[in-house]
Amino acid sequence: EEELQVIQPDKSVSVAAGESAILHCTVTSLIPVGPIQWFRGAGPARELIYNQKEGHFPRVTTVSESTKRENMDFSISISNITPADAGTYYCVKFRKGSPDTEFKSGAGTELSVRAKPSAPVVSGPAARATPQHTVSFTCESHGFSPRDITLKWFKNGNELSDFQTNVDPVGESVSYSIHSTAKVVLTREDVHSQVICEVAHVTLQGDPLRGTANLSETIRVPPTLEVTQQPVRAENQVNVTCQVRKFYPQRLQLTWLENGNVSRTETASTVTENKDGTYNWMSWLLVNVSAHRDDVKLTCQVEHDGQPAVSKSHDLKVSAHPKEQGSNTAAENTGSNERNIY
């Protein structure tokens, strides 16, 4: 001899966000007479999901025709599942009365919602850093469920190992977030480099999501300077060049000084790009040596990307050159003062 049993055959059901969840429930008898109700959670704070007898539940439909006299299937379908719907659902048989009283509950079905992580967002340091320095990159992704997730860091395809990752919250939640910080040592060749954060999750079916950061936005490669004296172009004129090599980014201002006095200031414009993404630039200065009685100290001073200026000097010997009478001009700058080198 038996009494009615409420059977929820599925201990757990996993559904992708946006899909419908079918929660199965059958009873073994038509008696006692009374409605079926579905709840999420147990105890006094449980949430009513569906009441066979009354109420409006727009997202819930019954799987079978519950108006049929012999119906004992009270399975329901919940549409447009979101992570907030996760929880344990109980099919509860009520006994007809005033009011109806709870007669028996099913064992419950745990609904887990598979929600895709958001596209990883990678952010680097606020200020640029120079080669040999270690910089930190962060990667964040949100809204995923279940909690299990894998995050990897790469630099130009090579997996990085120096990183720390946290998944929050630690306890049960409808959805989770991941936050990871990776340390990257910069090299002079990193202008074209990329740092990639790769997130793998069960919802992505083996096709991980990636977020990238270009090291070109992080790195500053300071220039190297070389000042050279070219053969005499014409009598009493000396061509001095300042070669600015391997710098990044392009923002650069060059000042020529003659014996400490500003002769000319210019901004790098027509630069050449190296294979590694850095730039080269050359500036030249025509010096009228006949205007000088003594040797001239020429200085090429470069201010790169707002950093303190670096300089390189060159001593120009003038004693061997005949002096023009009556000339007080310190220097003559004629013609083009920029030249591309390849």
């Epitope: 001899e1 038996e2 008898s29 038509l30 008696i31 006692p32 007479v33 006299r69 007809k96």
Partner: antibody, heavy 120, light 108 residues
Framework: QVQLQQSGPELVKPGASVKMSCKAS????????LSWVKQRTGQGLEWIGE????????YYNEKFKGKATLTADKSSNTAYIQLTSLTSEDSAVYFC?????????????WGQGTLLTVSA | ENVLTQSPEKMAVSLGQKVTMTCSAS???????LHWYQQKSGASPKPLIH???NLASGVPARFSGSGSGTSYSLTISSVEAEDAATYYC?????????FGGGTNLEIK
């Protein structure tokens, strides 16, 4: 048409047990709930309990738990009520009845009743 | 349980007379869940009215029912000899299903 045919009268001694039957015809026996109702001489009607033959599940009036046991045999379309530890209080006419429908709640069909007399 | 009290317990009326009997519930009953039966001596109960006011198959139109909440009534507009019987109300609002104690109608 729906018919409920009950077994004949019973005369039993106090302390004994009795099993009475109700044979259904004219409908699909396993699909409808059958109830049992007690009526003592010159008294009102008391609902004892009900059985769903489809899965042989029962539900009882608390007052009759331990006294009555409801069973059914789907192969013979027959429902049974067994009463144990009989006393004179159990002397009554016992009816089987079927609701009009699952959600009708009114007894549209009744058996003719079985008279149980408990006497030494 | 929901106790149904019928009154009067007995009544004797003349043919053609109008008769009203009541059924009072100890707790509210949905109108769709209140039913009436007629039982003649030595016979099983016969359905008379279901859901407060709906006549069962074959029941004459002189029978009618009304009521709501805890108060219900059965009326016979013009009593005939064959109406001599005991009348029972029954509720299906909650377990256990209960019947009233009956009203015995006698024809003078």
């Amino acid at each position: 048409q729906v018919q409920l045919q009950q077994s004949g009268p019973e005369l039993v001694k106090p302390g004994a047990s009795v099993k009475m039957s109700c044979k259904a015809s004219g409908y699909t026996f396993s699909e409808y709930v059958l109830s049992w109702v007690k009526q003592r001489t010159g008294q009102g009607l008391e609902w004892i309990g009900e059985i769903y033959p489809g899965t042989i599940t029962t539900y009882y009036n608390e007052k009759f738990k331990g006294k009555a046991t409801l069973t059914a045999d789907k192969s013979s379309n027959t429902a049974y009520i067994q009463l144990t530890s009989l006393t004179s209080e159990d002397s009554a006419v016992y009816f089987c009845g079927r609701f009009y429908d699952y959600d009708g709640g009114w007894f549209a069909y009744w058996g003719q009743g079985t008279l149980l007399t408990v006497s030494a | 349980e929901n106790v149904l009290t019928q009154s009067p317990e007995k009544m004797a009326v003349s043919l053609g007379q109008k008769v009203t009997m009541t059924c009072s519930a100890s707790s509210s009953v949905s109108s769709s869940d209140l039913h009436w039966y007629q039982q003649k001596s030595g016979a099983s109960p016969k359905p008379l009215i279901h859901g407060t006011s709906n006549l069962a198959s074959g029941v004459p139109a002189r029978f009618s029912g009304s009521g709501s909440g805890t108060s219900y009534s059965l009326t016979i507009s013009s009593v005939e000899a064959e109406d001599a019987a005991t009348y029972y109300c029954q509720q299906w609002s909650g377990y256990p299903w209960t019947f009233g104690g009956g009203t015995n109608l006698e024809i003078k």
